[in-house]
């Protein structure tokens, strides 16, 4: 058993049929010695008396808010949560496996630049009685500070018969060094509590591996005289690291016909302009990627050819 | 050239070669969703490689103030990786084929280090750790880790030379 926060405790249980469970001793936080009784949740049934209560925790029915009283007055509470371990593996019932970039990916994180700011998100089908808390650090043995905000519900989607809820959190490294080569990964730890079930999820990454620039901005077309060619120009996104002579991007320019089956013409360039042939009803799209490190491409910025 | 006396390197040449190094490092070990070998023993295998750290003066301001500290650090790293790529980690089984990108990487690391430090000048270099894995699978795992960390190192070096070529070239 360990303390998650004040008066909230997590009991770790091996979860299998007829498992013996864990013996837990609760102590009433009071100077009183006599006349103390214990109850669980809203029930008035007295579970025991005395300053300590010994219970055998085997299932969710044994978890909940234990309260000690004296003469009708509440003295203190202890909330017991369960953390299940099945076949040596901690349960992952609360969050959905996003399966990208690999199986057992529950947390996904992205950064728009090298400033040390990043966003993580996760998915669940649970709509109520759900709380999250997020901690992060750079490295684990001698951790350096990363400050995370509160997790918030950021999107709701209908997937078949189910509703899916996306939660996200923003974090910022306290002393970020954008130009350095990272040697220790960022660690993100999410505590999830649904009713009386506790689970924790972790992710470990370098900022450089989760970089995904915003799309290029100000995408413009300038027709070239007496030609089907156009000059496409764009700018670095505002959110990208500066100076751009140091934090450089590379770009992919694509001409795409109306039908998805039509052949796509692609050009790669380090410049912020390119000359392409504009076909009727086609659109021109541009996306960006770090020039020197193959992290994710941005989403496309697009303009119609006409 | 970035000689210890403090004259400037051939920024544009360094920029071109460092960008080629980035391309080669990624062709040698492309980004895949996951590794096919278990990523065991992460720490001890690559924590000895030289990293370009915050105080090494490789940020835009540090380069403007005095690029020598940063160039020396990059040179150290280039020599270190050049030795690793020439060691039995890469020469043992499974053998590199004649057209292996590792061979081109090795030559380019050497080329860039020579651009930074001409014959007759010496910056101190870091010892390479004595890692000689006996099993092919250990060797593969170590190669991937070295190539991954090389990708990160050459990305920073390429940024330095791109910025230098754009702002510090005579």
């Amino acid at each position: 058993i360990w303390e998650l926060k004040k008066d909230v405790y997590v009991v770790e249980l091996d979860w299998y049929p007829d498992a013996p469970g864990e013996m837990v001793v609760l102590t009433c936080d009071t100077p009183e010695e006599d006349g103390i009784t214990w109850t669980l949740d809203q029930s008035s049934e007295v579970l025991g008396s005395g300053k300590t209560l010994t219970i055998q925790v085997k299932e969710f029915g044994d978890a909940g808010q234990y309260t000690c009283h004296k003469g009708g007055e509440v003295l203190s509470h202890s909330l017991l949560l369960l953390h299940k371990k099945e076949d040596g593996i901690w349960s992952t019932d609360i969050l959905k496996d996003q399966k990208e970039p690999k199986n057992k990916t529950f947390l996904r994180c992205e950064a728009k630049n090298y400033s040390g700011r990043f966003t993580c998100w996760w998915l669940t089908t649970i709509s109520t009685d759900l709380t999250f808390s997020v901690k992060s650090s750079r490295g684990s043995s001698d951790p350096q500070g990363v400050t995370c905000g509160a997790a918030t519900l950021s999107a709701e989607r209908v997937r078949g018969d189910n509703k899916e809820y996306e939660y996200s959190v923003e974090c910022q490294e306290d002393s970020a060094c954008p130009a350095a080569e990272e040697s220790l990964p960022i660690e993100v730890m999410v505590d999830a509590v649904h009713k009386l079930k506790y689970e924790n999820y972790t992710s470990s990454f370098f900022i450089r591996d989760i970089i995904k620039p915003d799309p290029p901005k100000n995408l413009q077309l300038k027709p070239l005289k007496n030609s089907r060619q156009v000059e496409v120009s764009w700018e670095y996104p505002d959110t990208w690291s500066t100076p751009h002579s140091y934090f450089s991007l590379t770009f992919c320019v694509q001409v795409q016909g109306k039908s998805k089956r039509e052949k796509k013409d692609r050009v790669f360039t380090d410049k912020t302009s390119a000359t392409v042939i504009c076909r009727k009803n086609a659109s021109i799209s541009v996306r960006a990627q770090d020039r020197y490190y193959s992290s994710s491409w941005s989403e496309w910025a697009s303009v119609p050819c006409s | 050239r970035a000689v210890p006396g403090g004259s400037s390197p051939a920024w544009t040449q360094c920029q071109q070669l460092s960008q080629k190094l980035c391309t080669l490092a990624w062709s040698a070990h492309p980004l895949v969703g996951h590794m096919d070998l278990r990523e065991e023993g992460d720490e001890e295998t690559t924590n000895d490689v030289p990293h370009i750290q915050c105080g090494d003066g490789c940020d835009p301001q540090g380069l403007r103030d005095n690029s020598q500290f940063c160039l020396q650090r990059i040179h150290q790293g280039l020599i270190f990786y050049e030795k690793l790529l020439g060691s039995d980690i890469f020469t043992g089984e499974p053998s590199l084929l004649p057209d292996s990108p590792v061979g081109q990487l090795h030559a380019s690391l050497l080329g860039l280090s020579q651009l930074l430090q001409p014959e007759g000048h010496h910056w101190e270099t870091q010892q390479i750790p004595s890692l000689s894995p006996s099993q092919p699978w250990q060797r593969l795992l170590l190669r991937f880790k070295i190539l991954r960390s090389l990708q990160a190192f050459v990305a920073v070096a390429a940024r330095v030379f791109a910025h230098g070529a754009a702002t510090l070239s005579p």
Partner: nanobody, 121 residues
Framework: EVQLVESGGGLVQPGGSLRLSCAAS????????MGWYRQVPGKQRELVAT???????DYADSVKGRFTMSRDYDKRTVFLEMDSVKPEDAAVYYC???????????????WGQGTRVTVSS
């Protein structure tokens, strides 16, 4: 040039067994993935079984429980053990290997010339 050479094909009765071999000209540690594929005239090549470096084999549903893929690192060979053979297993069987990117700049995908399996009573 890296080569893969299949052998062991031939005539087998329904319900019978056959063992195919695929010998590599380089260490099989050189391959990120190795696989067996089969092709019937006029049809597309289909995956039979694959194995990744350090991993365990994956099988097509049609052969699960009947075929076993294994390898011998010392002999630089992968095998396909075919048991309880059915008439629909008749095909040309090809061995494939995908080389690690750091080993070569070209031709990451290597194919053998194929070995024919005929099922007839």
């Amino acid at each position: 040039e890296v080569q893969l050479v299949e052998s062991g094909g031939g005539l087998v009765q329904p319900g019978g067994s056959l063992r195919l071999s695929c010998a590599a000209s380089v260490s099989i540690w050189s391959f990120k993935v190795m696989g067996w594929y089969r092709q019937v005239p006029g049809k597309q090549r289909e995956l039979v079984a694959t194995i990744t470096t350090g991993g365990s084999p994956d099988y097509a549903d049609s052969v699960k429980g009947r075929f076993t893929m294994s390898r011998d690192y010392d002999k630089r060979t992968v095998f396909l053990e075919m048991d309880s053979v059915k008439p629909e297993d008749a095909a040309v069987y090809y061995c494939n290997g995908r080389l690690w990117a750091h080993l070569t700049s070209s031709g990451h995908d290597v194919w053998g010339q194929g070995t024919r399996v005929t099922v007839s009573s």
